[in-house]
């Protein structure tokens, strides 16, 4: 969490941002809140990016003001216009690109004063893994697949029964470049699997950590997956 305060002259207002991560090719949100004002026409929101000459987005006098917008953000940004009055300056970002990563500034002017806060935005690719029993294999084998990751993640297997065991000798992981030549498909195979056990396939890079669990018994197979972003720090 980054909390910024205004500059001298006028009164300062508190602006708060949260560091976040964007998934390449998907839509993202850059979070920013501020002390609200009673008049929408008195609120100015400016989003800036370090190293970019034009603005990322500007909202003032109750509408988007895009004459100074940098071309790399054209047609890709919007604020939640109906929530500005309650202090939400968060920015929607369409079709997140690798090059969108960097330091952003959320700069606010209201009738109460000015304030700003920086936000670190990471970009990459992350997806939920799915673990299945590989019935084509000669021995009991599990196959963990996740369609989109970047940068290249690490893959670690674990099991409930053999806690702390190192499965690197009995697993094989491969990374296959996807058609857009940035993200990769992750495939990891675990051999010599025993029944009545829960196995976890953990995929992690510096942006996200995802886990796919599978419990195999004689009567059923249960699966569960979850994904966690690693860098959500508020400012």
């Amino acid at each position: 969490l980054i909390i910024g305060f205004g500059i001298s002259g006028r009164h300062s207002i508190t602006v708060t941002t949260v560091a976040s991560a964007g998934n390449i090719g998907e839509d993202g949100i850059l979070s920013c809140t501020f002390e609200p004002d009673i008049k929408l026409s008195d609120i100015v929101i400016q989003w800036l990016k370090e190293g970019v000459l034009g603005l990322v987005h500007e909202f003032k006098e109750g509408k988007d003001e895009l004459s100074e917008q940098d071309e790399m953000f054209r047609g890709r940004t919007a604020v939640f216009a109906d929530q500005v009055i309650v202090g939400n300056a968060s920015l929607r970002l369409k079709n997140v690109q690798l090059t969108d990563a960097g330091t952003y500034k959320c700069y606010i002017i209201t009738s109460k004063g000015k304030g700003n806060a920086n936000l670190e935005y990471k970009t990459g690719a992350f997806s939920m893994p799915e673990v299945n029993v590989d019935y084509n294999a000669s021995s009991e084998t599990l196959r963990c697949e996740a369609p989109r990751w970047f940068p290249q993640p690490t893959v670690v297997w674990a099991s409930q029964v053999d806690q702390g065991a190192n499965f690197s000798e009995v697993s094989n992981t491969s990374f296959e470049l996807n058609s857009e030549n940035v993200t990769m498909k992750v495939v990891s195979v675990l051999y010599n699997v025993t029944i009545n056990n829960t196995y976890s396939c953990m995929i992690e890079n510096d942006i996200a950590k995802a886990t796919g669990d599978i419990k195999v018994t004689e009567s059923e197979i249960k699966r569960r997956s979850h994904l966690q972003l690693l860098n959500s720090k508020a400012s």
């Epitope: 895009l66 890709r76 079709n95 058609s179």
Partner: antibody, heavy 121, light 107 residues
Framework: QVQLQESGPGLVKPSQTLSLTCTVS??????????WSWIRQHPGKGLEWIGN???????YYNPSLKSRVTISVDTSKNQFSLKLSSVTAADTAVYYC?????????????WGQGTLVTVSS | DIQMTQSPSTLSASVGDRVTITCRAS??????LAWYQQKPGKAPKLLIY???SLESGVPSRFSGSGSGTEFTLTISSLQPDDFATYYC?????????FGGGTKVEIK
């Protein structure tokens, strides 16, 4: 509700400049929040996006036409215009003006009724 | 540029039929896809935006689905008024591009 109407000559000579205007009624271009686009459709063919403009004057053009296209806006008349230079018979098409749904979602609605421009000597 | 490929190019169907039109993008466009209906001599009419959101005033027999590169427009029960040409359009990235169209004609 917002309505759009294209106007301009239906016949243009080769090598000349095609000029069309889109008049917006039922809403103000200056209210912001929307990009205003030009789209064309060759006879019996599909649709081609030409470019767009924001009320403040910032534009984006389809790279395939960029060297020949100029889109401008006149907020006092609530109009935006298209100029396409050095036209050939390949520019014969129905030209539509349209509004995007928002600054981030550019599905087009509403559209003008379209105007046929024929390039011929 | 992102290429949009529609199939089939022509579709013959009868009133009451369930009709499905497919649109494929040359690269992922997330959910940034719109569908239009066009009748001869008229401007296209927006039916669906953001892949599955029904435009106000459009009958509920029209629905859209898909994300990434594969999308479908479904007409659950074809009505006489639905015989027209349908186009998909991506607004994920500039320049915006349209599919080649699917003409739905009477069988």
């Amino acid at each position: 509700q917002v309505q759009l109407q294209e106007s301009g000559p239906g016949l243009v000579k080769p090598s000349q400049t095609l000029s069309l205007t889109c008049t917006v009624s039922g809403g103000s271009i200056s209210s912001g929040g929307y990009y205003w686009s030009w789209i064309r459709q060759h006879p019996g063919k599909g649709l081609e996006w030409i470019g767009n403009i924001y009320y403040s004057g910032s534009t984006y053009y389809n790279p395939s036409l960029k060297s020949r296209v100029t889109i401008s806006v006149d907020t006092s008349k609530n109009q935006f215009s298209l100029k396409l230079s050095s036209v050939t018979a390949a520019d014969t098409a129905v030209y539509y003006c349209a509004r995007g749904l928002s600054t981030i979602d550019e599905a087009f609605d509403p559209w003008g009724q379209g105007t046929l421009v024929t390039v011929s000597s | 540029d992102i290429q949009m490929t529609q199939s089939p190019s022509t579709l013959s169907a009868s009133v009451g039929d369930r009709v499905t039109i497919t649109c494929r993008a040359s690269q992922s466009i997330s959910s940034w896809l719109a569908w239009y209906q066009q009748k001869p001599g008229k401007a296209p009419k927006l039916l669906i935006y953001k892949a599955s959101s029904l435009e106000s005033g459009v009958p509920s027999r029209f629905s859209g689905s898909g994300s990434g590169t594969e999308f479908t427009l479904t007409i659950s029960s074809l009505q006489p008024d639905d015989f027209a040409t349908y186009y998909c359009q991506q607004d994920n990235s500039y320049p915006y591009t349209f599919g080649g169209g699917t003409k739905v004609e009477i069988k």
